[in-house]
């Protein structure tokens, strides 16, 4: 169900788009992204738009996880799929609090 959750939750915020260590949104996010030839990076934050990103399957380059309780993204660890290189790397979307 991609309907926007009505209740706001507090989330851990650790990404280049965070003003402070926490944010408030409709859900919490954890994004693991690996750019070609570089180490994977983990971003934690909030989501309010583009909830379809939560449904994406993990790939070799991106894993986008969403959860719906306050600070549920604080200790989540993600892994990337060990698949063949796709023709295009997906773009990571992080929501500013």
């Amino acid at each position: 169900d991609l309907a926007k959750p009505s209740k706001l939750v507090n989330c851990t915020c650790e990404s280049p788009h965070c003003k402070r260590p926490f944010c408030q949104g409709s859900w919490c996010t954890v994004v693991l992204v690996r750019e070609q030839g570089r180490h994977p990076q983990v971003y934690r934050g909030c989501g309010s738009l583009n909830q379809e990103l939560c449904l994406g399957r993990p790939t070799e380059f991106l894993n986008h996880h969403c959860c719906y309780r306050s600070f549920c993204n604080h200790n989540v660890s993600l892994m990337l799929e060990a698949t063949q290189t796709p023709s295009e790397e997906p773009e990571v979307d992080a929501h500013l609090p």
Partner: antibody, heavy 113, light 111 residues
């Protein structure tokens, strides 16, 4: 690749108006808050305004509130800055920035009589 | 006058470690993340440090950030000639409800 391309700068007389545009590509524009930051010649960076993902929240630096208006069109992947009642002290390079990581190359606004 | 205070200049020789300070208040650095940007001559600012001490991918680990109370610092170790640039700290300010920058520090690599 994230790209931000500003346009609309130029020479304008005091009291005049300009509308700056910033064309975004390489990312889902509607997922990010955006800012305008300016830099007067030989000076430091000064934040101008920002706007949230859907355009419902806007913040301005006090000295520009009322004269400048930030807006966005997510269907066109474009950020705007409408500047009215321009003064000589508004002369600067204006940068469009994805909060808080990527910046465009800037567009020069010169206010002179 | 900038809300965040930085020294106007700093210098060092190749291989040295240089530190640039950034002083603020409880409404900005004290309660929010600190960011550091590098601006090479004639170019747009580039993000060096976010979230007080995190590096975006592609930024060398010679650059490190720290924060304590209402002050922050950027350290550059193994100084190189290509590090010669202006460095700016930034943070969100809850009182002003806006982003504030330091006045910038011009780093000169001697010799």
């Amino acid at each position: 690749e994230v790209q931000l391309l500003e346009s609309g700068g130029g020479l304008v007389q005091p009291g005049g108006s300009l509308r700056l545009s910033c064309a975004a590509s390489g990312f889902t524009f509607s997922s990010y808050a955006m800012s305008w930051v300016r830099q007067a010649p030989g000076k430091g960076l000064e934040w101008v305004a920002n706007i949230n993902q859907d355009g419902s929240e806007k913040n301005y630096v006090d000295s520009m509130r009322g004269r400048f208006t930030i807006s966005r069109d997510n269907s066109k992947n474009t950020l705007y800055l409408q500047m009215n009642s321009l003064r000589a002290e508004d002369t600067a390079v204006y940068y469009c920035a994805r909060e808080f990581d990527y910046w465009g190359q800037g567009t020069l606004v010169t206010v002179t009589s | 006058q900038s809300v965040l205070a930085q020294p106007p200049s700093a210098s060092g020789t190749p291989g040295q470690r240089v530190t640039i300070s950034c002083s603020g208040s409880s409404s900005n650095i004290g309660s929010n993340y600190v960011y550091w940007y590098q601006q090479l001559p004639g170019t747009a600012p580039k993000l060096l440090i976010y979230g007080n001490n995190k590096r975006p991918s592609g930024v060398p680990d010679r650059f490190s950030g720290s924060k304590s109370g209402t002050s922050a610092s950027l350290a550059i170790s193994g100084l190189r000639s290509e590090d010669e640039a202006d460095y700016y700290c930034a943070a969100w300010d809850d009182s002003l409800n806006g982003r504030v920058f330091g006045g910038g520090t011009k780093l000169t690599v001697l010799g």
